[in-house]
């Protein structure tokens, strides 16, 4: 008796596909050992066709895969484009050789069944309509025309030319003739359901001279498309329902026992479990739309169905499309915090993962908005300038090659709370969702800049200091100058910052930045921050206004400036190869609104980074002669 279990007999039709699930006992060894699918020959040998080690035989190339689901103690063999040659005896099993634990599976692939030659077959999907053609001889032209559905004993009327209609076909069946052709009538049945499948007879005239035609109507439920996605990745359900439902409300629902629970629809309904991680996008006028879900969870696995109906709810007899989503817990996407907490006035540094094989992809950060169908306007990106309302407080730091980029948002307010997405123009599976929670601050911030009303005088020396607590003593401190293309780290030289010290004086921990001499280009936002290697920590921002020497009062109100100064910022380009690409508008507004939709821009010849290299000051020359120093006291 084998501990492996699966279907003993699988029967399918040529051209179709099978998905065979094999169950194995719950042990660590079983979860990690080789899984295989082999075909038994007459000699008793079992020839491997596919295995979890990556082996794929020639006859399965491009039409089969094997996926292990260790969390369920199952593995699945999917085989497509079946032919009668696939009929045979197989084994699914575990072990380094094909003599390990296994289960016998018999696969039978049949030809599409044939019906008597005088039967016309109509094959339609659920929710669609069919037009049955019923020919007759000219002498039966004046006679009654009818369509009936065969039951065990009799043939039950569907509709006839005297306008009699079976109650279950009212509003769905129409009998008509086209033009002047008096040798054929038609019956159209719309909103087809499973119950409409069966044998029909259309008839013109009565008695032995009547014209009869046999019709076999097959109403197919769409076969679920199998989707295999990693935990924390994203999935897109592409739904194509056809032109006839283009103007109806669209929905995506998940099968739940008896019902299909709507997750999202175009009428504004949305399941709270998907808050912050779902968008529905109408594609065109042909009834096509897509639903994107990010941050996949284990419990998202299941059967999904999309459809269209004026109610935005599933309705029998309306077209649908179905999927079965599997969520694999052996995910390549790192487990990151899905909730980030900040306080008013403070800052957050969000580490966004991306596919490390795509380090040159463009990185973006957008804010999910649930109104309407949901959309995610881009706030910052490697080639997308920071949105105006985030001036001075948002920057993206790209850390090439390590699979992470960082987004920093400071000067937090409670209005910043919400859902944000990390995404690239590369591998769409790596879209991740972060919920930002902002609480009212109950204590002083960790980083404080003095003077707070920073107005520098042209040509003079100006110093600002950033005070930090002892807990940041061992971390790297930095100043950077913000522009809408990033925050460029300023060159620093340490003055005794790393001298060994037994005690830490809370009052004297500070890092200073000096502008000498002050130029007009120095005006703008500056950030003081801490980081450890490539991991960014807290930041604080200050606006430095620059005024000419005058006897009168300052022409810039420093308080207003520090709140959110709207000053035209200039910033030299770090990498000359970036400049001509910098201000490209990204066309096609969609779920990523404000004409900044993320599109696959294609391979970049090199990595285009608008934000400065956080770890070095190389190449960051200044257009003015002012000197930047970091002094540690």
């Amino acid at each position: 008796k084998s501990p492996i279990f699966g279907p003993q007999e699988v029967s399918s039709i040529e051209g179709d596909s099978v998905s065979i699930t094999c169950y194995y006992p719950d042990t660590s060894v079983n979860r990690h050992t080789r899984k295989y699918w082999c075909r038994q020959g007459a000699s008793g040998m079992c020839t491997t066709l596919i295995s979890s080690n990556g082996y794929l035989s020639k006859e399965y190339s491009g039409r089969a895969n094997l996926i292990n689901f260790p969390e369920n103690n199952t593995f699945v063999i999917n085989i497509e484009q079946l032919t009668q040659d696939d009929t045979g005896s197989y084994k699914c099993g575990l072990g380094t050789s094909n003599r390990g634990l296994s289960f016998d599976v018999s696969l039978e692939v049949s030809q599409v069944p044939e019906l008597p030659s005088d039967t016309h077959v109509y094959t339609k999907d659920i929710g669609r309509n069919v037009t049955i053609e019923c020919p007759f001889k000219r002498e039966n032209a004046p006679s009654k025309k009818s369509l009936c559905k065969k039951t065990n004993q009799s043939c039950e009327l569907v509709i006839d030319s005297t306008e009699k209609v079976n109650p279950s076909y009212i509003g769905r069946a129409k009998l008509f003739m086209k033009g002047t052709d008096l040798t054929v009538f038609y019956v159209n049945i719309s909103h087809l359901t499973h119950n409409d499948a069966g044998l029909y007879i259309c008839q013109a005239g009565e008695g032995p001279s009547a014209d009869k035609k046999n019709v076999d109507l097959q109403v197919l439920a769409p076969e679920p498309e199998l989707l295999y996605k990693d935990l924390r990745s994203s999935v897109t359900f592409e739904c194509d329902l056809g032109r006839e439902v283009a103007n109806e409300a669209k929905y995506l629902c998940r099968m739940n026992k008896e019902t299909c629970d709507v997750i999202i629809n175009t009428l504004g309904k949305r399941d709270p479990d998907f808050e912050g991680r779902i968008l529905i996008t109408p594609k065109d006028d042909n009834g096509r739309f897509s639903v994107l879900i990010t941050g996949l969870r284990k419990e998202d696995a299941g059967h999904y169905q999309c459809g269209a109906h004026s109610s935005g709810l599933p309705q029998e007899g309306w077209p649908i499309q179905t999927w079965q989503l599997f969520v694999n817990e052996e995910s390549t996407i790192p487990n990151r915090r899905s909730v980030v907490k900040g306080v008013t006035g403070g800052s957050v540094a969000i580490a966004c993962p991306y596919n490390p094989k795509e380090s040159s992809s463009l990185k973006y950060w957008c804010r999910w908005e649930g109104d309407g169908n949901g959309h995610c306007p881009v706030l910052v990106g490697t080639q997308a300038q920071v949105q105006e309302e985030y001036e001075g407080r948002l920057a993206l730091f790209d850390q090439p090659g390590n699979g992470t980029y960082t987004v920093i948002l400071n000067q937090l307010t409670t209005e910043d709370a919400g859902f944000y997405w990390c995404l690239t123009n590369g591998d769409s599976r790596w879209r991740t969702t972060i919920e930002l929670q902002v609480a009212e601050a109950t204590r002083e911030p960790n980083l404080e800049v003095t003077p707070q009303n920073a107005t520098a005088v042209l040509g003079e020396t100006f110093t600002v200091s950033c005070h930090y607590p002892c807990k940041f003593y061992s971390q790297e401190k930095y100043w950077c100058k913000w522009s809408n293309k990033g925050c460029h780290i300023l060159p620093s030289h340490d003055e005794g910052a790393r001298q060994s010290s037994v005690s830490c004086d809370q009052s004297s921990q500070l890092v200073s930045m000096t502008l000498n001499p002050v130029s007009k280009e120095d005006e703008g936002w500056y950030w003081c921050g801490v980081k450890q290697g490539q991991t960014y920590g807290e930041t604080t921002a200050i606006y430095i206004a620059v005024e000419e020497r005058t006897r009168g009062s300052s022409h810039v109100n420093p308080t207003d400036a520090n709140a959110r100064a709207k000053v035209a910022l200039e910033e030299e380009v770090v990498d000359s190869s970036i400049s001509e690409k910098e201000n490209k508008a990204i066309p096609n507004p969609g779920p990523f609104a404000n004409e900044r939709e993320i599109q696959n821009v294609g391979d970049q010849a090199q990595e285009n980074r608008a934000s400065g290299d956080a770890g070095s000051a190389d190449g960051q020359s200044r257009s003015s002669s002012s000197k930047h120093h970091h002094h540690h006291h």
Epitope: Y23, A221, P224
Partner: nanobody, 127 residues
Amino acid sequence: EVQLVESGGGLVQPGGSLRLSCVASGLPGSSSRMAWFAQAPGKEREFVAAIAWRGRTSYKYYSDSVKGRFTVSGDNAKRTLDLQMKDLNPEDTALYFCAAHPNDDGDPRISGNYQYWGQGTQVTVSS
């Protein structure tokens, strides 16, 4: 409302045959799974056989104790399930339940993976 009605149970001699039938009305979903479970007096319900449909493909499952003796068949469109039982022995005596689920999720041997149940039909194997 989903209803499952079993029929075909009865008294049969050891070595004899019996055919059980089940009709499910109102079962939602396009793919589905239907199964037979047996409950002997004082025992837990045990998996006997199942059939799952996905599109035009069917998958048949059997417990080790009935392999080669019982044959499961059915029609997804009509939502019917049959169990042809041959070479019956006294250990097969039980109340046979028909179970159905609107899709093919989860291990078919586990009774918790079925949403709907019939009332059962008694099979007694005795001389």
